[in-house]
């Protein structure tokens, strides 16, 4: 099925995290010679949606006017020329933040922590939930920084950070989510400030264990679990 | 209206091959997916294949798989079903339906043919 | 492989609501399933009624309706008529397959 044309963009907005009951506009874009447009949800029955170009032709809008956990998954889109249909663009993984209630962070012993030390982070669920994540706001790529383990449910999961160096200072917050779908997370916990004081002589992270890796375009959040951690902070269940 | 009306059943023995045609009117063949459906005598219902709007995927069930091929000719408005390999447990009869331009629009299997008997018997 | 199991039989009169239940072998039935309702009458007479778990095919009678009802999928009957005896059937989608379930026969006395 797939053609030699190239492959289309496909992005969301206002983000690819979207909160319950808001709207999000998927945006497929391919050429000019682009007669109409596909997009594919990873394991649907039938194509997720079907739209004509919109002028000049090498883009097509698709609309989701209340974000539900029918529309979180991944998304493919292809293009179809008088030649036939192209590659697939690149996945995007459309995330719905919302379907369970927050959990809570906290640290540990504080969050007032002396570069060098250590702290941990510390998510808390009421019910029992198999994946955690930790995002650190104004990161570059936020989704992508931690997940804990995949194990059996857990009430909370722990996230140490050793040893503390300023750049880990900033807002934290965390999620939880059930093995059966990472598209679907939690509302989000109330932010965590993590203030690192004495920073003289601040020790350089190593390239392994680097804070805020940049991911690129085709980095999407919410990788299977087992993925290297993008993130000094160590993923670990309690 | 929508209509659709297989052909092409039969008695056959076993280990032959047989193709049953769906024909299609009243829609815009071309635009949508399309399902295989069977029914044993006396049984419910068992699911065989669907094939997408373009031909370009195609999902069979664990039974049939190997054995069975869905394909459509959209200039014909028709779907076909290429039985190879039959067993005596091919025995039903068997139902095209119709599938959904997409997710966002449509409901899947809502219009149905009448059906066509196979027979697998020596 | 999934199985995908139903009532066999239910019973109920005219004026009634009446939900048939659609469970699924390998856990709860979840959108991704995209559970289908599809009812046969007499002399192999099939109409689809709810896909998507709770989207209607246009022109279905607007009491029956498809929801989630715990880990199952459910078609409800509001006020149940005459003319709904007959068998349903629910079908779920398990990433490259669709499995039927074997099917509620619907008496309406």
């Known amino acids: 099925q797939a053609g030699p044309l190239p492959k289309p963009t496909l992005w969301a907005e206002p983000g690819s995290v979207i909160s319950w009951g808001n709207s999000v506009t998927i945006w497929c874009q391919g050429t000019l010679e682009a007669r109409e447009y596909r997009l594919d949800k990873e394991e649907s029955p039938a194509p997720w949606d079907r739209q004509n170009p919109l002028e000049p032709k090498n883009k097509a809008r698709f609309s989701i006017p209340s974000m539900t956990e029918d529309y979180a998954g991944r998304y493919r889109c292809y293009y179809r020329s008088p030649v036939g249909w192209s590659q697939p663009s690149d996945p995007l993984e459309l995330v719905m933040t919302g379907a369970y209630s927050k959990p809570t962070l906290s640290a540990l012993p504080s969050p007032l922590v002396t570069s060098g030390k250590s702290v941990t982070l510390l998510c808390q669920s009421r019910s029992p939930m198999d994946t955690f994540l930790l995002i650190k706001e104004r990161a570059a790529h936020p989704l992508l920084h931690l997940r804990s383990e995949h194990g059996a449910q857990q009430h909370q999961a722990e996230f140490p950070m050793s040893p503390v160096t300023s750049v880990h200072g900033g807002t934290y917050r965390c999620f939880s989510s059930h093995g059966f779908s990472h598209y679907l997370l939690s509302h989000p916990s109330d932010p965590l400030e993590l203030i690192v004081s004495g920073s003289l002589e601040d020790p350089r992270p190593s390239p392994t264990r680097s804070v805020s890796t940049a991911a690129g375009p085709e980095d999407q959040p919410l990788m299977p679990t087992g993925s290297v951690p993008h993130s000094g902070l160590r993923r670990h269940w309690e | 209206q929508v209509q659709l009306v297989e052909s092409g059943g039969g008695v056959v023995q076993p280990g032959r091959s047989l193709r049953l045609s769906c024909a299609t009117s009243?829609?815009?063949?071309?635009?949508?997916?399309m399902h295989w459906v069977r029914q044993a005598p006396g049984k419910g219902l068992e699911w065989v294949a669907l094939?997408?709007?373009?031909?370009?995927?195609?999902y069979y069930a664990d039974s049939v798989k190997g054995r069975f091929t869905i394909s459509r000719d959209n200039s014909k408005n028709t779907l076909y079903l290429q039985l190879n390999s039959l067993r005596a447990e091919d025995t039903a009869v068997y139902f095209c339906a119709r599938d959904v331009i997409s997710m966002v629009r449509g409901v899947p299997f809502d219009y149905w043919g009448q059906g066509t008997l196979v027979t697998v018997s020596s | 492989d999934a199985v995908v199991t139903q009532e066999s039989a239910l019973t109920t009169s005219p004026g009634e609501t009446v939900t048939l239940t659609c469970r699924s072998s390998t856990g709860a039935v979840t959108t991704g399933n995209y559970a289908n309702w599809v009812q046969e009458k007499p002399d192999h007479l099939f109409t689809g009624l709810i896909g998507?778990?709770?989207n209607r095919v246009p022109g279905v009678p607007a009491r029956f309706s498809g929801s989630l009802i715990g880990d199952r999928a459910a078609l409800t009957i509001t006020g149940a008529q005459t003319e709904d005896e007959a068998i349903y059937f629910c079908?779920?989608?398990?990433?490259?397959?669709?499995?039927f379930g074997g099917g509620t026969k619907l008496t309406v006395l």
């Open positions: 009243g829609f815009t063949f071309s635009s949508y997916g």
């Open positions: 094939i997408w709007f373009d031909g370009g995927n195609q």
């Open positions: 998507g778990i709770k």
């Open positions: 079908a779920l989608w398990y990433s490259n397959h669709w499995v």
